[in-house]
Interface confidence: low
């Protein structure tokens, strides 16, 4: 048994006679046999479910349901309860209903089985009938709102009278009827106002039916029409079995180069017409069992199980449903030596699913591990500038499908045949498993007889020992200039495009910096700055070589603060800067102001335009001006 | 830092139950397989059961399957094994351990173990 | 379940010698092999994992190596502190499974 509602609004007055009827409360059958029994709470509650008093008042008839006044509510029984609440003004009060056999203990009121009962009280006597409005005559002041179990035997689930109207007002007639399509489930019955299922529903076919009730008022001459909504929700069971979407059952995948825990590997996908159980329960409930259950496979991977909700076109209308994407993971890093074929199945079981049929279905994972061998082109060539400065980038390294690879570790050695000039130094890049060459050791480069540079780079996997092998011939070409004089250790500290590339700063491959000029849009990820190295710096990204050094590219890297228009990055660094983005590494501060024009670098034209408008637009435009510099600092 | 603290053991009789926890600390609990290892007196390690992070999986070794039961409150950062009907041979000093998540299942911090004495 | 089979079960070495232990499996397990340090009353130590990375922290005196079936723990010069019970570990499957372990006294 189930209530058809989970709340039930009356008014109640000051006075009110004894034996007045108040509302029906209606419960459904589950099955054809069950005969309801209701049971009244015993208290009253009010204010934030404040318990006011035992409920003498109000009583109901155990088999149909009806509410009404067993004693007169008179004002000092009123003001009692008030006095109760909490100091709260008591507009409403409510009681709990019980469909039997539940517990008797009275608890928590959740439906089906408990409905709240909810009294608007009117601190007055019943108002005159003939100033009743033809709304208040026809329904409460709350819409009913209905909930039907899919499946159940039908029943009577609403009264439409206003039991208390028609107890005090007997000379105002009240007609009802319900506005609906050809051949839907309900009824109004004319002599007893009762609405009924006429068969029962299948939420599948249709889940929500938006009615509408017409109350039609005769007071002696006049007649009254008032509409309003009868909504009614059919509510799931599990009846319905999972099915494969266009019966696609089996899912093939190779894992070769993503071989990184968590890589999803193969999904397939499972429908649901029903969209219980809820979603609290639903991982409870729907199991998966990944087999078979050895103990490698089940080290490997792991089903993930993504339930989503749906809508699907049934009879014209929408419904829910739901989709059950099955996820085959890597449950670890697999190693690269690892070399196999296997059929994996997944067990999916809907264990609320009452059939007919089984509520069982098996998904097919076929699934090719592949090894991973290491190759390196036969040779490398490259070349780098004497003037190069320490941790300039000069190339990459890749072992063939690096840019692929994740979940494999690959490392990078550099082997020198000259000890003397060993120069260069390789980090592997996190990102791409490639490794980045860069500048070490500047001293080694600068020597004459260190004009062409052998190294043997050597890439490893360590968990499995697997090495490759390619030769790297440097070049080492130009001439050594020394640093000009005062030139700050990082390339990020000039502000201005002639004192930048005059310098030079950690991590320059040409031994100067360069200017990045922005695109002047007001915060912009293209800011201008001074870097070692456009191609690298300001990127965006912390690459492995600039995590070095904080000097290379604290646009980049800083963690420190920020002064000025920007957006930080993440985790570090400027995302976007207002202007020119200029940094004090050792200082940890970075500043993005407005590009300001200064006298030095303005020619006579550009001078002479200033002192125009200076003079003809005078000192108030003037503080203007400064205020809305003062504005772009602070944004 | 990473700590994990280990308590609930003591003696008790065969047959008897007896419940250990393991507060985590220093870490996120909930991205981290769990694991009890015991050790009996003079003995080597002996791996005893594992519940995975997210508490989806659990394996237990052979000798204590249907007896023991290994459960994690992730809000709590605690980890547990229940231990049903004890014999003599589960006298033991327990640890509880952190899989690291790297390749394979490697233990790579462990409490400092609480003694389970099973004696009548 | 996968066996681990330690060698030697004990052994006498003085400061400064090089020590090395062996553990063989039942059957290949890749490199899924770490390797502990136990000192009296105290809980293990990783110190190897993936048969060949050394664990952040532990001196570079300790090496392993091997892979499928056969592996190997190296002390290239044992140390005062480095007196311990040391235990192989598959991590290849479960039941996880332990060496017996290797004792190293002081000769």
């Known amino acids: 048994l189930y209530f058809s509602r989970d709340a039930y609004w009356e008014k109640l007055y000051v006075d009110q006679p004894a034996g007045t009827p108040l509302l029906y409360v209606h419960a459904l059958r589950d099955a054809p046999e069950e005969v309801p029994s209701f049971r009244l709470g015993q208290h009253l509650y009010g204010t934030y479910r404040t318990r006011l008093h035992e409920n003498n008042w109000i009583c109901i008839q155990e088999d149909t349901g009806l509410l009404y006044l067993n004693r007169s509510l008179d004002r000092s029984s009123w003001e009692k309860l008030s006095g109760r609440n909490r100091g709260f003004p008591l507009l409403t009060v409510y009681l709990k209903v019980f469909l039997s056999p539940t517990s008797l203990r009275e608890g928590e009121c959740q439906w089906p089985g408990c409905a709240r009962v909810y009294f608007s009280f009117f601190n007055t006597s019943f108002p005159a009938c003939t100033s009743l409005k033809p709304r208040e005559l026809c329904f409460p002041e709350t819409r009913p709102s209905f909930r039907i179990r899919e499946n159940r035997p039908p029943g009577t689930f609403h009264q439409f009278r206003l039991l208390p109207v028609q107890f005090l007002c007997p000379n105002i007639s009240v007609a009802y009827r319900l506005l609906e399509g050809e051949g839907l489930p309900f009824r109004c019955a004319p002599d007893s106002l009762e609405v009924s299922t006429r068969w029962a529903l299948d939420r599948e076919q249709r889940e929500k039916y938006e009615l509408v009730a017409v109350c039609t008022v005769h007071a002696g001459a006049r007649e009254e029409v008032v509409m309003v909504p009868f909504p009614v929700t059919v509510y799931d069971e599990d009846d319905s079995a999972p099915t494969f979407p266009a019966g696609v059952d089996t899912a093939s995948a190779v894992v070769e180069f993503k071989r990184k825990e968590d890589t999803v590997v193969a999904t397939l996908r499972v429908f649901d017409a029903d969209v219980v159980p809820a979603s609290g329960e639903l991982v409870r409930r729907y199991t998966s069992t990944l087999l078979p259950g050895d103990t490698w496979t089940q080290q490997t991977f792991r089903v993930e199980h993504w339930p989503n909700e749906t809508s699907v076109q049934a009879n014209g209308s929408f419904v829910r449903a739901t989709v059950h994407d099955y996820r085959l993971v890597l449950n670890r890093n697999l190693s690269i030596s690892e070399n196999r074929t296997m059929q994996l199945a997944v067990l999916v079981n809907d264990s609320d699913f009452q059939g007919p049929g089984a509520g069982v279905l098996l998904l097919h994972f076929n699934v090719s591990v592949l090894p991973v061998s290491l190759h390196l082109p036969s040779s490398y060539s490259l070349s780098v500038s004497r003037r190069a400065r320490r941790f300039a980038q000069i190339g990459k390294v890749c072992v063939e499908n690096c840019q692929a690879f994740s979940g494999i570790n690959v490392q990078y050695e550099l082997h020198s045949s000259g000890a003397n000039c060993s120069t260069l130094g390789v980090v592997t890049s996190a990102e791409d498993t490639s490794g980045i060459l860069f500048v070490n050791d500047t001293k080694a480069l600068r020597r004459p007889k260190c004009a062409e540079l052998h190294y043997m780079v050597v890439a490893t996997n360590h968990q499995t020992s697997r090495q490759a092998q390619a030769q790297l011939l440097v070049t080492v070409e130009g001439l050594y200039v020394a640093e000009e004089a005062g030139c700050p250790l990082s390339c990020a500290v000039s502000k201005r495009r002639p004192e930048c590339e005059e310098c030079g700063g950690l991590g320059s491959p040409t031994g100067r910096c360069e200017w990045r000029q922005g695109d002047g849009k007001g915060i912009t990820r293209n800011f201008s700055t001074c870097s070692p190295s456009t191609k690298t710096c300001p990127d965006g990204h912390c690459d492995v070589v600039e995590t070095q050094d904080i000097n290379i590219c604290p646009q980049d890297c800083l963690r420190g603060s920020i002064v000025g228009g920007h957006e930080p990055g993440e985790p570090r660094g400027i995302k976007a800067g207002y202007g020119t983005c200029n940094c004090f590494p050792e200082e940890e501060k970075c500043f993005c102001e407005p590009e300001d024009i200064q006298d030095p670098l303005c020619d006579e034209l550009c001078r002479e335009q200033k002192l125009i408008s200076e003079e003809d637009l005078g000192g108030e435009q003037k503080l203007i001006s400064e205020e809305d510099l003062h504005h772009h600092h602070h944004h | 830092q990473v700590q994990l603290v280990e308590s609930g053991g003591g003696v008790v009789q065969p047959g008897r139950s007896l419940r250990l926890s393991c507060a985590a600390s220093?870490?996120?609990?909930?991205?981290?397989?769990m694991h009890w290892v015991r050790q009996a007196p003079g003995k080597g390690l002996e791996w005893v059961a594992v519940k995975r992070y997210d508490g989806s999986d659990e394996y237990f070794v052979d000798s204590v399957k249907g007896r023991f039961t290994i459960s994690r409150d992730n809000s709590k950062n605690t980890l547990f094994l229940q231990m049903n009907s004890l014999r003599v041979d589960d006298t033991a000093v327990y640890y509880c351990a952190r899989e690291t998540p790297i390749t394979g299942t490697t233990l790579d911090y462990w409490g400092q173990g609480t003694l389970v004495t099973v004696s009548s | 379940d996968i066996q681990m089979t330690q060698s030697p079960s004990s052994l006498s070495a003085s400061v400064g010698d090089r020590v090395t232990i062996t553990c063989r499996t039942s059957?290949?397990?890749?490199?899924?092999l770490n390797w502990y340090q136990q000192k009296p009353g105290k809980a293990p130590k990783l110190l190897i994992y993936?048969?060949?990375r050394s664990q952040s922290g532990v001196p570079s005196r300790f090496s392993g190596s091997g892979s499928g079936t056969d592996f190997t723990l190296t002390i290239s010069s044992l140390q005062p502190e480095d007196f311990a019970t040391y235990y192989c570990?598959?991590?290849?499957?479960?039941?996880?499974?332990f060496g017996g372990g290797t004792k190293v006294e002081i000769k």
């Open positions: 220093g870490f996120t609990f909930r991205n981290y397989g």
């Open positions: 059957q290949s397990i890749t490199n899924y």
């Open positions: 570990q598959q991590s290849y499957s479960t039941p996880l499974t």
């Open positions: 993936a048969a060949s």
